[in-house]
């Protein structure tokens, strides 16, 4: 008995070969002897039932001259899994067709961190093994259900599942979209008074995107977090529902989500969490955003440089006179120089020699009144 594997919804070709390599009379039947189709000597394909009943069944007329009389079954259904009989030259050939189906749990659009379950449906009597490969090359194998917990952004794309039965294999491709922001976290460095832009690009594209979102902000100086803005997303159009009076944020009406803070001030330095709840999805998308603000000031004989916000302990804060060595350099959030020389001073926030933020301040010469003899 010949075994043919097929995929639900696709086509299968069941072989039937003549030893004489020429056109001959043949008939395909179900195992209960009901006729499917055949050729009775006139080179015409005769179907065994009503067109509507047998429109999925066909043969390859072009192959008949070569002694090949396959049964083509289109739009395969799970219930097509059975034995088919080819009657040819006073002999009967049995062909077993097994139709398989691999599906993703409920939805192919899943939030980052959620679980993906791939389920194999197979005909009774079969004992297939299945192995799935993720877009990033990770293999998972198991029985009729395969699970991947904590989906990551790199899991977006085509998953390839190979079903193996009696040394024959059939391959399934399933497109999975992991719904997430492109970046889990971002940091913005600004001088005091500069305009601040926050961008929240999504890592996926869909035709219609509907949901609602909010940006919560925890200022370094504040004891509790505060909702800065809430918004709706309908068919990819962003509309602001509520915004705080201080700061007065502006939000773009198109994707990617984009917010503008009129100016960076020490009281705004801190961390934010933008959440986006998508329609018909459980859970939320998150992106963290951080704001570091720098201020350089001169008060009487003291030149000070300060930073506010979430800086890592390895960041270096320096004060230097232009084109000279740093006068002071510390892994702290404030540095100062007493009685600074006149000239253009630079306050630098750097990470392993790479400048993240720079603020210039001009120190004017102090003219001391000459002492009278």
């Amino acid at each position: 008995k010949t075994l043919v594997l097929g995929k639900e919804g696709e086509s299968a070709e069941l072989p039937c070969e003549s030893s004489q390599k020429k056109i001959t009379v043949f008939t395909w039947k179900f195992s209960d002897q009901r006729k499917i189709l055949g050729q009775h000597g006139k080179g015409v394909l005769i179907r065994g039932g009503s067109p509507s009943q047998f429109d999925r069944f066909d043969s390859k007329k072009g192959a008949w001259e070569k002694g090949s009389f396959p049964l083509i079954i289109n739009k395969l259904k799970m219930e097509d899994s059975q034995t088919y009989i080819c009657e040819l030259e006073n002999r009967k050939e049995e062909v077993e067709l097994w139709v398989f189906k691999v599906t993703a749990n409920s939805d192919t659009h899943l939030l980052q961190g959620q679980s993906l379950t791939l389920t194999l449906e197979s005909p009774p009597g079969s004992s297939p093994s299945v192995q799935c490969r993720s877009p990033r090359g990770k293999n998972i194998q198991g029985g009729k259900t395969l699970s991947v917990s904590q989906l990551e952004l790199q899991d977006s794309g085509t998953w390839t599942c190979t079903v193996l039965q009696n040394q024959k294999k059939v391959e399934f491709k399933i497109d999975i979209v992991v719904l997430a922001f492109q970046k889990a976290s971002s940091i913005v460095y600004k001088k005091e008074g500069e305009q601040v832009e926050f961008s929240f690009p999504l890592a996926f594209t869909v035709e219609k995107l509907t949901g609602s979102g909010e940006l919560w902000w925890q200022a370094e100086r504040a004891s509790s977090s505060k909702s800065w803005i809430t918004f709706d997303l309908k068919n990819k159009e962003v509309s602001v529902k509520r915004v705080t009076q201080d700061p007065k944020l502006q939000m773009g009406k198109k994707l990617p989500l984009h917010l503008t803070l009129p100016q960076a001030l020490p009281q705004y330095a801190g961390s934010g969490n933008l959440t986006l709840a998508l329609e018909a999805k459980t859970g939320k998308l998150h992106q963290e955003v951080n704001l570091v603000v720098m201020r350089a000031t001169q008060l009487q004989k003291n030149l000070t440089c300060e930073v506010w916000g979430p800086t890592s302990p390895k960041l270096m804060l320096s004060l230097k006179l232009e084109n000279k060595e740093a006068k002071v350099s510390k892994r702290e959030k404030a540095v100062w120089v007493l009685n600074p020389e006149a000239g253009m001073w630079q306050c630098l926030l750097s990470d392993s020699g790479q400048v993240l933020l720079e603020s210039n301040i001009k120190v004017l010469p102090t003219w001391s009144t000459p002492v009278q003899p």
Epitope: Q195, K234, K254
Partner: antibody, heavy 118, light 107 residues
Framework: EVQLLESGGGLVQPGGSLRLSCAAS????????MSWVRQAPGKGLEWVST????????YYADSVKGRFTISRDNSKNTLYLQMNSLRAEDTAVYYC???????????WGKGTTVTVSS | AIQMTQSPSSLSASVGDRVTITCRAS??????LGWCQQKPGKAPKFLIY???TLQSGVPSRFSGSGYGTDFTLTISSLQPEDFATYYC?????????FGQGTKVEIK
């Protein structure tokens, strides 16, 4: 061919009302946001109002908020602007515009003139 | 509301000249900016969206550039039919705001 045809303009006294219509053709009306933009005599362009596609979110310029109402009838492929409590400064040519997929006003009608005068 | 400032307010140029019009936004608007052209007594015609994307049917002598707050409309070789008033429009958020316009006149 995409076409927008405004109507309903005319002379009205201060405090009066007027309803502008915009008949759209040549595109699937319900799937695009639509807007009104006006131009006072000898002046520049001023955005008045926008209504999003079949969701129907509406947005207004501060100068018309509370007095003007934008609406649409997708079954008739028509956009409307109901203008109440009209003032002399509302005198302008009113243009109907269609937004493209990127929400830009890519097609403009020829305009209809509204004159508010006693 | 976001203010859009266009410069110059008017300019005189000859056929074949390269013309540049600038538009500045009072805050960052990404590339959410469009340009339109209006001839006297006519409805405006849309030229460019997303700062640099040419509307279909618009001649390639028109080009746009910019991001954030500073934007430019360039006509590489001015043609007789290009004498008109040009407006920039921010489409970052509501209220949508136009620049005051730049009138391109024949020298």
């Amino acid at each position: 061919e995409v076409q927008l045809l405004e109507s309903g303009g005319g002379l009205v006294q201060p405090g009066g009302s007027l309803r502008l219509s915009c008949a759209a053709s040549g595109f699937t009306f319900s799937t695009y946001a639509m807007s009104w933009v006006r131009q006072a005599p000898g002046k520049g362009l001023e955005w008045v109002s926008t209504i999003s596609d079949n969701i129907g979110n509406t947005y207004y310029a501060d100068s018309v908020k509370g007095r003007f109402t934008i609406s649409r009838d997708n079954s008739k492929n028509t956009l409307y602007l109901q203008m109440n409590s009209l003032r002399a400064e509302d005198t302008a040519v009113y243009y109907c515009t269609k937004d493209n997929e990127d929400y830009y006003m890519d097609v403009w009608g020829k305009g209809t003139t509204v004159t508010v005068s006693s | 509301a976001i203010q859009m400032t266009q410069s110059p307010s008017s300019l005189s140029a000859s056929v074949g000249d390269r013309v540049t019009i600038t538009c500045r936004a009072s805050q960052g608007i990404r590339n959410d900016l469009g340009w339109c052209q209006q001839k006297p007594g006519k409805a405006p015609k849309f030229l460019i969206y997303a700062a640099s994307t040419l509307q279909s049917g618009v001649p390639s002598r028109f080009s746009g550039s910019g991001y954030g707050t500073d934007f430019t409309l360039t006509i590489s070789s001015l043609q007789p039919e290009d004498f008109a008033t040009y407006y920039c429009l921010q489409d970052y958020n509501y209220p949508r705001t136009f620049g005051q316009g730049t009138k391109v006149e024949i020298k």
